[in-house]
């Protein structure tokens, strides 16, 4: 069993919902878009791979959450936090944030109006 169970508490909370979904396809999808032909990422070779693979699964996972501004923002913040240490410079951080904010639209969801993606104590 490899799944981490959600935290205890209100099962309808955004925190629990974000815990239950697999955000890795979203992370890979964005990394692929900003890295293109660069080296391997996370042991999964994103070179010459269609981004639509990751995008379909990513959208499916985001769709599992209640489509609220707050929950979507929490998911985006979690993706940012997960990938923060892999982003090599300021430019890459900004690219990642830009793609991340476009993600809900790509999945035909409402984008959160205000979502602070400055996570990891300002590192990202």
């Amino acid at each position: 069993m490899r799944r981490e169970r959600g935290r205890q508490g209100d099962s309808s909370s955004c925190e629990r919902q974000v815990d239950r979904v697999n955000l890795k396809p979203c992370e890979q999808h964005i990394m692929q878009r900003i890295m293109g032909e660069q080296e391997q990422y996370d042991s999964y070779d994103i070179r010459s791979t269609r981004s639509s693979d990751q995008q379909q699964r990513c959208c499916d996972e985001l769709n599992e959450m209640e489509n609220t501004q707050r929950c979507m923002c929490e998911a985006l913040q979690q993706i940012m936090e997960n990938q923060c240490d892999r982003l090599q410079d300021r430019q890459m951080v900004q690219q990642f944030k830009r793609e991340l904010m476009n993600l809900p639209q790509q999945c035909n969801f409402r984008a959160p109006q205000r979502c602070d993606l400055d996570v990891s104590g300002g590192r990202c």
């Epitope: 799944r3 697999n22 791979t49 639509s52 693979d53 699964r57 499916d60």
Partner: antibody, heavy 123, light 108 residues
Framework: EVQLVESGGGLVQPGGSLRLSCAAS????????MNWVRQAPGKGLEWVSS????????YYADSVKGRFTISRDNAKNSLYLQMNSLRDEDTAVYYC????????????????WGKGTTVTVSS | EIVLTQSPGTLSLSPGERATLSCRAS???????LVWYQQKPGQAPRLLMY???TRATGIPDRFSGSGSGTDFTLTISRLEPEDFAVYYC?????????FGQGTKLEIK
């Protein structure tokens, strides 16, 4: 013990209907995507349909689209496959399978399978 | 639809030998979404490998997976009697989640 048990198979005439059920036990059913996979006699595996945890996303193979309907009842720990307008080529063993993912790296996989239920479409 | 073609259709080898099974995709597949299953007669399929190269729980280390893009390989370094079965690759990144037609590994 983690277990999936399919039921509802049987002999049906072409054009007929059948509803398959899959009873899950030993795990938190609502935490997993679920799939139906079939295998015609002497043939390979064919993915049929999948449904996400909350039922918000559903996919079908082209061969069954418009005829089969997947659904789930998380309160009853059950997965269903409603099969209408059945054809000879739908004859197969139908497996219910749980889909999990590796939380650290992300890949998906079907890690728990039922023993299958046999559907025979014949006049 | 992504078509997965497995080769050879049948592989005849002896215990102790090395088996190399191929899975070729009609379009590029992220190795994140490439899975291998083993099936024995009268049994349900069993998960072997996911993410193209990660062994499932309880799978011995004689099984290994590799590949990316359109070409993937399952290797069994030293065949044991219980390894003779049918092997299927599957892509589960883009619906429909297609399987290959299978490779039958039989005792020579």
């Amino acid at each position: 013990e983690v277990q999936l048990v399919e039921s509802g198979g049987g002999l049906v005439q072409p054009g007929g209907s059948l509803r398959l059920s899959c009873a899950a036990s030993g795990f938190i059913f609502s935490d997993y995507n679920m799939n139906w996979v079939r295998q015609a006699p002497g043939k390979g595996l064919e993915w049929v349909s999948s449904i996400t945890r909350s039922s918000r996303t559903i996919y079908y193979a082209d061969s069954v689209k418009g005829r089969f309907t997947i659904s789930r009842d998380n309160a009853k720990n059950s997965l269903y496959l409603q099969m209408n307008s059945l054809r000879d080529e739908d004859t197969a063993v139908y497996y219910c399978a749980r889909e999990d993912f590796d939380v650290s790296t992300g890949p998906y996989y079907m890690d728990v399978w039922g023993k299958g239920t046999t559907v025979t479409v014949s006049s | 639809e992504i078509v997965l073609t497995q080769s050879p259709g049948t592989l005849s080898l002896s215990p102790g030998e090395r088996a190399t099974l191929s899975c070729r995709a009609s379009q590029s597949v992220s190795n994140m979404f490439l899975v291998w299953y083993q099936q024995k007669p009268g049994q349900a399929p069993r998960l072997l490998m996911y993410g193209a190269s990660t062994r499932a729980t309880g799978i011995p280390d004689r099984f290994s997976g590799s590949g990316s893009g359109t070409d993937f390989t399952l290797t069994i370094s030293r065949l044991e009697p219980e390894d003779f079965a049918v092997y299927y690759c599957q892509q589960n990144g883009n619906s429909p989640y297609t399987f290959g037609q299978g490779t039958k590994l039989e005792i020579k």
